[in-house]
Interface confidence: low
């Protein structure tokens, strides 16, 4: 092909090529042609004769102002036609007359201000019609019943002001899953407008200034329709009462989106008419008081989003939003509750009572004063089968005994990014019989004891990053009971002292994070009592991170038991000489990071075993000694390996001898060196 199109598997991509005409030298068997972002003004039908197999044609982002009816005659198999972002202004009855197999027609962002006659009458198979971002002033798309298989009609960002039954009755035989009317200036819903449509399942009216009054009228018009999904985000719905959604009583509404409405007052029984609702979006509102009956009637809601729905109006404590006890008791089927980023004063004793199916609860950054978690804090969740609880970013400073004893089903507990500072006696976790992960990273300080985790033997993931960990060197180890642990993160704790039995018995451990500590002394031969082999017995360890620990020595047998090690990170240490055979047992190693150390020599006897099956190597920023003895084997290996070595040319530079300083290692000439073959 003389054009620069890329062709793969019957798909031709000719986008962004400044084309002024359709290429005439593409394979004739292509089924998908992308001509977007070019300078096409016309689509001569003749140019497509050779591409009769096309099922998808995308000519978006061009300057096409007219379409030849014969185009589809040449493309009898065309299913998807995308004309978005062009300059079409008129559609005649002939325009798409031959496009009888279309399932998708995209006309968004053109200049179509009016639809005359019946340009879509032949599109009996059309599923999606996108006319958004045009200048349409009405929903009138024809004068006779048509588009019986249409499922998605997208009319957002037009100038539609009223919905009229006589304009929508062309859809009398259609089942619309999605009628998208967002970002229009709709001020009127004429009687019967939605009943004109055969079946309407989804209606989207986001960014339409409805307000409470027009919303109520809308809902009355939706009565006795098939509506399932209704989206009214950013529709200036500042208050709701027990009549706002009355019309929806005669529907089976499943999803309601009222997000971004600055909703201030949610009156009692506002949603009593929605017993079928399953998904309810209320995020980004301004509710000042949730009454005990505000959510009454929502018996089938599975998912409720209340993120940033309760925010304080001023710095005054009196202006804090209120949630009455038992407000959620109606939500018997609720499984997922998001209450992130709110200004709720605290958790009352019956705040969550009645949520008998709740599985996921996010209370991240939800409270203004949740300093201490007591054995009463979560009593209202006692009958909830909660699996995941997120309590991050709440300035929690203390967890008292039995704080979670009500949550016997809990599997994931996230307490990260708080201000917890205390000794962990182990009683904090009592009752967490099914706990799988506890995330405690980024807290003030945690002092461990031998029983800190004695009551959670089921724990598989424990995250203790940057918690100023104390007593980690106590014996027996605080981690001894955690025989099922697979992930342990102890990074960023400035740990200097640990015993060789710290990880004893953790035979299932797969990931161990110890980066950013101060463990250098432990591996020094001069250490009193000799090096500390704290990695012994970890036969299933897959990932080991020891970055930034100040190591300048590695004992020869320190990795001896790590037969399944796949990734090891020893970057940002002070390693110079590594003992021969240190990596001998790492036959499964896939990734080795030694960047920013003081390594001068890369010899086969040290690195040969580690490099054998490596897919990724990072030894950037080491002061390599470019002599035959030090790097000849390495250079030959580099030039023959399939291992990925990022920035090999720029960040693997010789430091010595002086005449090689700054010279790329990979260009070092090994031809005069003896015995440097990388593979024998």
């Amino acid at each position: 092909s003389t054009t620069k199109c890329t062709v793969s598997h019957e798909v031709a991509d000719c986008s962004h090529l400044k084309l002024t005409q359709v290429p005439d030298d593409l394979p004739t068997n292509i089924t998908v042609l992308n001509l977007t972002h070019n300078q096409l003004r016309r689509l001569p039908a003749a140019n497509f004769t050779r591409y009769s197999q096309l099922t998808s044609l995308d000519v978006g982002f061009n300057t096409i102002s007219k379409l030849e009816p014969e185009l589809c005659q040449k493309l009898p198999m065309l299913k998807v036609l995308n004309l978005q972002h062009n300059e079409l202004s008129q559609l005649s009855d002939k325009t798409f007359a031959f496009c009888t197999n279309l399932t998708e027609l995209h006309l968004m962002s053109n200049s179509i201000q009016k639809i005359k006659n019946n340009p879509f009458v032949k599109q009996k198979n059309l599923i999606t019609l996108d006319l958004s971002h045009n200048g349409l002033s009405s929903t009138k798309l024809g004068t006779q019943v048509q588009l019986e298989n249409l499922q998605e009609l997208l009319l957002s960002n037009n100038k539609i002001q009223a919905l009229k039954s006589e304009e929508l009755d062309i859809f009398a035989n259609s089942s619309l899953k999605k009628l998208e009317l967002s970002s229009n200036q709709i001020k009127e819903f004429s009687p019967g407008c939605f009943h004109a449509i055969g079946r309407l399942f989804g209606l989207f009216l986001n960014n339409v200034q409805l307000g409470p009054s027009l919303t109520e009228k809308l809902c009355l018009e939706l009565a006795n329709t098939s509506i399932r999904n209704l989206s009214l985000s950013n529709s200036q719905l500042s208050t709701t009462s027990n009549t706002t959604f009355l019309g929806l009583k005669w529907t089976n509404l499943t999803m309601l989106d009222l997000s971004y409405n600055n909703l201030n007052v949610v009156g009692n029984d506002s949603f009593a008419w929605l017993p079928q609702l399953e998904y309810f979006f209320l995020e980004y509102n301004n509710i000042q008081h949730l009454f005990s009956h505000s959510l009454h009637g929502l018996f089938n809601v599975r998912y409720l989003n209340l993120k940033r729905s309760f925010t304080k109006q001023s710095i005054s404590l009196a202006s804090l939003p209120k949630i009455d006890d038992f407000s959620f008791q109606w939500l018997k089927c609720l499984e997922h509750l998001n209450m992130e980023d709110n200004d709720i004063p605290g958790i009352k004793s019956n705040m969550f009572t009645g949520l008998i199916n709740l599985k996921y609860l996010s209370l991240s950054n939800s409270f203004t004063s949740l300093r201490t978690l007591t054995n009463e804090t979560f009593v209202s969740l006692a009958h909830s089968p909660l699996h995941i609880l997120n309590l991050t970013k709440n300035k929690i400073s203390k967890i008292e005994s039995d704080a979670f004893s009500w949550l016997g089903h809990l599997e994931v507990l996230d307490l990260g990014l708080n201000e917890i500072g205390q000794e962990l006696t182990g009683q904090e976790w009592r009752g967490l019989e099914n706990i799988f992960e506890i995330y405690l990273s980024y807290n003030k300080y945690l002092q461990l004891t031998r029983n800190s985790f004695a009551l959670v033997p089921s724990l598989q993931r424990l995250m203790l990053r940057r918690v100023a960990l104390k007593n980690v060197d106590s014996s027996p180890s605080p981690f001894q009971p955690l025989r099922n642990l697979t992930i342990l993160d102890l990074s960023n704790n400035n740990i200097a002292n640990i015993n060789d039995d710290m990880l004893e018995g953790l035979e299932k451990l797969e990931i161990l994070d110890l980066q950013h500590n101060n463990l250098a002394r432990l591996w020094k031969h001069a250490n009193p009592g000799g090096p500390i082999y704290f990695l012994k017995g970890l036969s299933h360890l897959h990932i080991l991170n020891l970055e930034s620990n100040g190591f300048d020595e590695i004992p020869v047998e320190v990795f001896k038991d790590l037969f399944e090690l796949k990734i090891i990170d020893l970057g940002l240490n002070n390693l110079n000489t590594l003992p021969a055979s240190v990596f001998n047992n790492q036959v499964s190693l896939k990734s080795l990071n030694l960047q920013k150390n003081l390594i001068t020599s890369v010899e086969k006897k040290v690195f040969g075993p580690a490099f054998r099956n490596l897919t990724e190597l990072d030894m950037r920023f080491n002061p390599f000694d470019c002599t035959c003895e030090s790097i000849a084997w390495f250079v030959n290996w580099i030039n023959e390996t399939h291992t990925n070595i990022p920035e090999l040319s720029s960040h693997y530079l010789c430091n010595t001898p002086p005449h090689y300083h700054g010279f790329p290692v990979r260009l070092f000439d090994t031809s005069s060196c003896k015995d440097s073959a990388p593979f024998e």
Epitope: N252, N300, E411
Partner: antibody
Framework: QVQLVQSGAEVKKPGSSVKVSCKAS????????IHWVRQAPGQGLEWMGE????????NYNEKFKTRVTITADESTSTAYMELSSLRSEDTAVYYC????????????WGRGTLVTVSS | DIQMTQSPSSLSASVGDRVTITCRAS??????LAWFQQKPGKAPKSLIY???TLADGVPSRFSGSGSGTDFTLTISSLQPEDFATYYC?????????FGQGTKLEIK
Amino acid sequence: QVQLVQSGAEVKKPGSSVKVSCKASGGTFSTYWIHWVRQAPGQGLEWMGEINPNNGRINYNEKFKTRVTITADESTSTAYMELSSLRSEDTAVYYCARVGVMITTFPYWGRGTLVTVSS
Amino acid sequence: DIQMTQSPSSLSASVGDRVTITCRASGNIHNYLAWFQQKPGKAPKSLIYNAKTLADGVPSRFSGSGSGTDFTLTISSLQPEDFATYYCQHFWSTPFTFGQGTKLEIK
């Protein structure tokens, strides 16, 4: 003890429809979702959809959405699965299953209904 | 949709053997994984739910593990009645797809 009793085997012609029933006893019918699973001869299990008998709310597997209709009659504690436009590859055992207090497993299963599609 | 990939598809073992079957999800299903046992001509039987909780009446030789995308069913010491086909199924979001099954046969 919860029991799910299914209707008997059926032989159907290609293009026709079949309606399989599943009657529950020994538990609260309306508060537990009923699921339908099928298994072609010698093949694995395939989840078709679920229904909340309390409100008729249904979640279908998209693969079957155009051809399957799941319904429930609370008064008789019976769930139904109707499959239309039958093809030979729809020959399978059709099971109904029910969740328990824990809604992340099926402790209760019907015995299955063999539907044979043959011309 | 989340796909479930089970391995191996068949397995020969002897009474007393330790057997491991794995199941991988194409997306994160948290802990919402169940294992079922099915014998010829019978409906499946629940063994394990929430990845590791034993269903009522299931012998302790059965155990489950894993989270996120990788899961394992282990039978610590095979008994004659354990020879059957085993399926994993996720319960995270519909469709609740099954693995393709692992047939456990007598060696």
